[in-house]
Interface confidence: medium
């Protein structure tokens, strides 16, 4: 028999959604809803904000975060960094996978101090069984959660 | 025989492109080109702006819209909402799947009132046969169509 | 035996990353790292900035570029165009596949001249064997490279 990852098992996939508990303020990664509403895990597991790989392979991983604020008050970073990071047992520090920097405060206008912006990341990376992927946003105080449709995190094997 | 969706049939996929008729001004979803140029349907169908699922499963759905304007004239929303929404026979209202809010007018500069911005959405959702996905943009008057490469809508089964 | 592209061979995929040599200033496409770090080629090849298709089919192609600058100095375009383009032996000119226009300089604020922005493109296109896909950014002088995580280019068969 020809061994091929898709021949007799489901293709690993997941879509996790933002929730009220996503922003911890602890300096850790964002946390996610894994079961309710649009969220699901199929052939991947979840632990403390991380998607955990159970089957090695190439995965398209993605995340979107909804950003919003009122001007750029002092003390808030004028640059927002949104990234997907890998944790591996073989290395003590997180490894940057896909990262974006944005300056969303500049979207405030003379007629409206309120601004909204969105950051999307997606790309293919190789992940081994047991490796984890997390999402970080600095400054996470500018992430605007609502109903799981505006900030999310997912992956599927390609 | 082991049943697996990819073993003997094409994987459903589609890419629909923006066209002059995309913006109806009727309050409905955006309409799309399904055949000409880069547009195609494979294992999915189309109806009045909607991608219609023929085979249940998890799909990566995506959309990009090109936004553009001249400053932020009165009466135009300073916040643009771009979203992918599900229609299902089991529920009377559209369900938000993936949504972004942006404040693109703030991109106008002192030297140029003209601004351009782009919004991309993508994520994995479960869709049943017969369910539909549509794209909406509020305020759609800021969507800039040209040749099908700047605003589009697609999906593929994962 | 049922012939199906996934049954006995790897699914073509690639992820190429930005490097110091990416920006040539020659008017050509961006160049990419294909082997080091997160970069890989699997069932696709690479030539002078282009992903080259070896197996015909539908591919989800994607690219992200990290943009950054200091206001909008004289002579720099206030509009940035980021696009994925197809080269085919059957046609003398490049064909636009997926394109975005952005006006990132407007993100500079009264409190910060420095701005950052990111452009993401992704969509499904049909590619024949021997056809090539490249990434172009105009004005490429605003692309900020660092470590391969902020600007990248990839594809996988769907």
């Amino acid at each position: 028999l020809i061994q091929e990852r898709r021949s007799h098992e489901v293709n690993p996939a997941a879509h996790l959604t933002g929730a009220n508990s996503s922003l911890t303020g602890s300096g850790g990664p964002l946390l996610w809803e894994t079961q309710l509403g649009l969220a699901f895990l199929r052939g991947l597991s979840y632990h403390d904000g991380a998607l955990v790989v159970t089957k090695a392979g190439y995965y398209y991983i993605y995340s979107k975060v909804q950003l919003g604020g009122v001007g750029c008050p002092l003390g808030l970073a004028s640059t927002i960094t949104h990234g997907l990071y890998k944790r591996t047992p073989r290395y003590p520090e997180e490894l940057e996978l896909l990262v974006s920097q944005q300056s969303p405060c500049g979207r405030a206008t003379s007629s409206s101090r309120v601004w909204w912006d969105s950051s999307f990341l997606g790309g293919v990376v190789h992940l081994e069984a047991g490796e984890e992927v997390v999402v970080r946003v600095l400054d996470e105080r500018l992430v605007r959660l609502r109903d799981g449709t505006r900030s999310y995190f997912g992956a599927f094997m390609v | 025989l082991i049943q697996e969706r990819r073993s003997h049939e094409v994987n459903p996929a589609a890419h629909l492109t923006g066209a002059n008729s995309s913006l109806t001004g009727s309050g409905g979803p955006l309409l799309w080109e399904t055949q000409l140029g880069l547009a195609f349907l494979r294992g999915l169908s189309y109806h009045d702006g909607a991608l219609v699922v023929t085979k249940a499963g998890y799909y990566y759905i995506y959309s990009k819209v090109q936004l553009g304007g001249v400053g932020c004239p009165l009466g135009l929303a300073s916040t643009i909402t771009h979203g992918l929404y599900k229609r299902t026979p089991r529920y009377p209202e559209e369900l938000e799947l993936l949504v972004s809010q942006q404040s693109p007018c703030g991109r106008a500069t002192s030297s140029s009132r003209v601004w351009w911005d782009s919004s991309f959405l993508g994520g994995v959702v479960h869709l049943e046969a017969g369910e539909e996905v549509v794209v909406r943009v509020l305020d759609e008057r800021l969507v800039r169509l040209r040749d099908g490469t700047r605003s589009y809508f697609g999906a593929f089964m994962v | 035996l049922i012939q199906e592209r996934r049954s006995h061979e790897v699914n073509p995929a690639a992820h190429l990353t930005g490097a110091n040599s990416s920006l040539t200033g020659s008017g050509g496409p961006l160049l990419w790292e294909t082997q080091l770090g997160l970069a890989f080629l699997r069932g696709l090849s690479y030539h002078d900035g282009a992903l080259v298709v070896t197996k015909a089919g539908y591919y989800y192609i994607y690219s992200k570029v990290q943009l950054g600058g200091v206001g909008c100095p004289l002579g720099l375009a206030s509009t940035i165009t980021h696009g994925l383009y197809k080269r085919t032996p059957r046609y003398p000119e490049e064909l636009e596949l997926l394109v975005s226009q952005q006006s990132p300089c407007g993100r500079a604020t009264s409190s910060s001249r420095v701005w950052w922005d990111s452009s993401f493109l992704g969509g499904v296109v049909h590619l024949e064997a021997g056809e090539e896909v490249v990434v172009r950014v105009l004005d490429e002088r605003l692309v900020r490279l660092r470590d391969g995580t902020r600007s990248y280019f990839g594809a996988f068969m769907v």
Epitope: T79 | - | G71, P73, L76, S110, S112, R113, D139
Partner: antibody, heavy 117, light 107 residues
Framework: QVQLQQWGAGLLKPSETLSLTCAVY????????WNWIRQPPGKGLEWIGE??QYNPSLKSRVTISVDTSKNQFSLKLSSVTAADTAVYYC????????????????WGQGTTVTVSS | AIQLTQSPSSLSASVGDRVTITCRAS??????LAWYQQKPGKAPKLLIY???SLESGVPSRFSGSGSGTDFTLTISSLQPEDFATYYC?????????FGGGTKVEIK
Amino acid sequence: QVQLQQWGAGLLKPSETLSLTCAVYGGSFSGYYWNWIRQPPGKGLEWIGEINQYNPSLKSRVTISVDTSKNQFSLKLSSVTAADTAVYYCAREIATADKGYYGLDVWGQGTTVTVSS
Amino acid sequence: AIQLTQSPSSLSASVGDRVTITCRASQGISSALAWYQQKPGKAPKLLIYDASSLESGVPSRFSGSGSGTDFTLTISSLQPEDFATYYCQQFNSYPLTFGGGTKVEIK
């Protein structure tokens, strides 16, 4: 090799207008900021401004203009006083990713301006 | 306006010494900082841009570090031609501002 050559009157009376010009040789005007900086005798450096952006402490008296056809930019400072006595420099700010960011990488030779009655 | 405070304002050192000059910004400026060397009667010369990038042609004994509010210029082994005044400058926001300068003299 990009060079900046500057010139203008070196001796002024109070209330007159200082006028200096800086020419860019061997390089593009495009994609850079073009600045004026001054340095009073024995003191530190003070940024005067660039096209469309001036130091608030001088804003009411400063005009910086550009002539792209000649690859030149100019500084005018009105109603000068003895406090405006300084060496005046023109300088280019690198501002694109192909060269780098955040530095004045090319400077003019400096023009000593003295304001005295 | 963002204030840049350089320290020390002057220092005496010998050839071969390791010299460190600091520049503190009154608010965060990311990496938008440069270092210059100025000799009497001459225009300033760019040494370091983007906080830590060495300008072309500048000897590798010069290095810059820091981000946010605290920045450092280091000369790993002072040479006779390095005796001069050093300035930091921020590019993050208008008005652009310079530090007060650090004069490096021969001990």
